[in-house]
Structure formats: C-alpha cells, structure tokens
Interface confidence: low
C-alpha cells in the first residue's frame, strides 16, 4: 500500500529521452512501478521501470528512439503516468500532462578540450550533445573553474548568454593545475533547467618564463 504525498518530475532532453523522478513519502513495499508515456499525437507509447535512487525516490529514462532523432516537437503533449503493481492490477500513482519543450534539461556538454594554453590564460572548447535543431543559437552556458585549495561550490560562475561553445579563461596562475566544467540551458521553457555539469577537464597552465616578472 502507498500513503503520503508524491512528487513526479520529468525533463525532456530535446531529442529522444524523457528522464523522470518520482518521490513518495509513504512506504512502497516490494512494489514494481513504471512510468508510462502516452503522446497525444504520436502512434508510439513507451514505458520504463522505476528504479530506486534513494529510500523514497525512484528514477527512470524513457528512451523514445535513436539518441539524435527528433521524437517530439513544441506542439506535443505527453501524458505521463506512474503505475505501480497492486496484485494483478496496475494503480495510477501520479499523472501529468507533460509539455516537452516547457520542461527541458539537455545532456551535459561533451568533448571538452584545451585549444590553447599559456601562462595566464587557457582557451577551451566543447560540444553540445543530443540538442534539438529547433534551438538554433538560442542556448546559454555556465562555466566554472576549480582552482587549487577551493571546492566546486566556491568557484564563481561564468555566464555565456549565447550559443558560444568555447571560452577563454584569463588571469590564471602560471604552472597551476585547474579543472573546468560547463553546462547548457535552452532559453525556451517555463520549467527548463540547467543540464548536468560536464565531466571536468583538467589542464595545467604553462610555467612562467625564467627571468621575467609574472
């Protein structure tokens, strides 16, 4: 049996994946649950099995097709249901009419690389992954650099208010190890949120030339 309040949150990666998290305050005792997606104007429907991520929350990914296929558009509405098995029947635990392009969270940027590094600056590039062609240039990025003796949470955020898949970090310290991360967000969507942070890219600035002020 299920009691208590539940929260059901899903995001569309803009191409062929809807990721969902369902949180339930009450106890779920050995119950099998799944998310079911039923689009209003498509011939397919899809399910995924909810797997525990903590004591009171479950997650799953609805794989709608090939990673770069455009499975939904701005006019689609997808009815998403959490269904849990009760004996031989399935019970609806949560439901929402999901507008994919109002609830976007893109994949983390990939292919981070150092284009050029000097003593005090470093030019880094990256690529976006599985992002809809609908966005064209309507994306923004946040980046952060981890310097020695600090944590990621302390790192100041650098905002790029346009689709710019590179950055030139300046005022760096020579011969120092840094790490860099970036994330992306479309400008579209009332409930759109930032992508996860990219995998960190480690780089080291060049040592200062001997006999010169630094």
């Amino acid at each position: 049996a299920v009691n208590g309040t539940s929260q059901f949150t899903c995001f569309y990666n803009s191409r062929a994946n809807i990721s969902c998290v369902w949180s339930q305050d009450g106890a779920l005792q050995d119950t099998s649950c799944q998310v079911h997606a039923w689009p209003d104007r498509r011939r397919w429907n899809q399910t995924c099995e909810l797997l525990p991520v903590s004591q009171a929350s479950w997650a799953c990914n609805l794989i709608l097709g090939a990673p770069d296929s455009q499975k939904l558009t701005t006019v689609d509405i997808v009815t998403l249901r959490v269904l849990c098995r009760e004996g031989v029947r399935w019970r609806v635990m949560a439901i929402q009419d999901f507008k994919p392009f109002e609830n976007l969270r893109l994949m983390a940027p990939i292919s981070l690389q150092v284009v050029h590094v000097e003593t005090h600056r470093c030019n880094i590039s990256w690529e976006i992954s599985q992002a809809s062609h609908y966005f064209e240039r309507h994306l923004e990025f946040e980046a952060r650099t981890l310097s020695p003796g600090h944590t990621w949470e302390e790192a100041p955020l650098l905002t790029l208010k346009q689709k710019q898949e590179w950055i030139c970090l300046e005022t760096l310290t020579p011969d120092t190890q840094y790490e860099f991360q970036v994330r992306v967000k479309p400008l579209q969507g009332e409930f759109t949120t930032w992508s996860p942070w990219s995998q960190p890219l480690a780089f080291r600035t060049k040592p200062a030339a001997l006999g010169k002020d630094t």
């Epitope: 701005t74 062609h133 609908y134 064209e136 240039r137 579209q188």
Partner: nanobody, 123 residues
C-alpha cells in the same frame, strides 16, 4: 507597428504552382520566426509551414511535406511559400504569421497575422 502583407494568391489548376510572399514592416525582420497558416471554408485555421529567424530550420504539416517549400529573404524582409503539385484540398485563405518565439509559432493566439490571400485550386 508590426504589419504583415501577403501577396501571390490566385486561381490555379490542380497540379499547378503558386508562390506566396509576405512582407514584414514595422520591426526588425530577423527577430521573427515566420509561418504560413491556412483556413479552408468552414474549417479551423491550420499550421502549414514555418521558418526560423536565420532560415536554417523549417517545419511542415505532413500534408504539404515535399510539395511546399517555405523560405525567407532577410534582406527583403520577406517570407515565401512555394506551392507545387497543388490539390483542390489546398484551397484556402493563406495567412502569414510572425512570432519572436519559434516555440510559440504554431499557437494561434500569440502570433501577429497578415490579412490573408486566397488560393483556389480547381480540378
């Protein structure tokens, strides 16, 4: 004030072609995603095609895919709809629409509209 003026409609035989044009004035053209809609007698206005501000991304309703082509000339502040292999069921008033948000262009209530141009396809 933003204004859209369509032209190019007319009477054509089935299988023929027409090219509609829509000129935008009163604002910067490249700010807008542009679209064509149509309304047949006794029916609701329906989306036909759209083109994003840069012209790189186009979208079509399934019934016109492969027959109609939407394009724009940002130097002339004009969007076009090239209609080939026309069918009697394409008969309608064709409307031009503009929206600064690509994602709202199919939404009937959030667009700026032209006055429409009549297209009649006879069999």
């Amino acid at each position: 004030q933003l204004q859209l003026v369509e032209s190019g409609g007319g009477l054509v035989q089935a299988g023929g072609s027409l090219r509609l044009a829509c000129a935008l004035s009163g604002d910067v053209f490249v700010r807008y995603t542009m679209a064509w809609f149509r309304q047949a007698p006794g029916k609701e206005r329906e989306f036909v095609a759209s083109v994003t501000d840069s012209g790189r991304t186009t979208d079509y309703v399934a019934s016109v895919q492969g027959r109609f082509t939407v394009s724009r000339d940002n130097n002339k502040n004009t969007v076009y709809l090239q209609m080939n292999s026309l069918k009697p069921e394409d008969t309608a008033v064709y409307y031009c629409a503009a929206n600064t948000d690509y994602f709202q262009i199919r939404s009937l209530d959030r667009n700026t509209w032209g006055q429409g141009t009549q297209v009649t396809v006879s069999s």
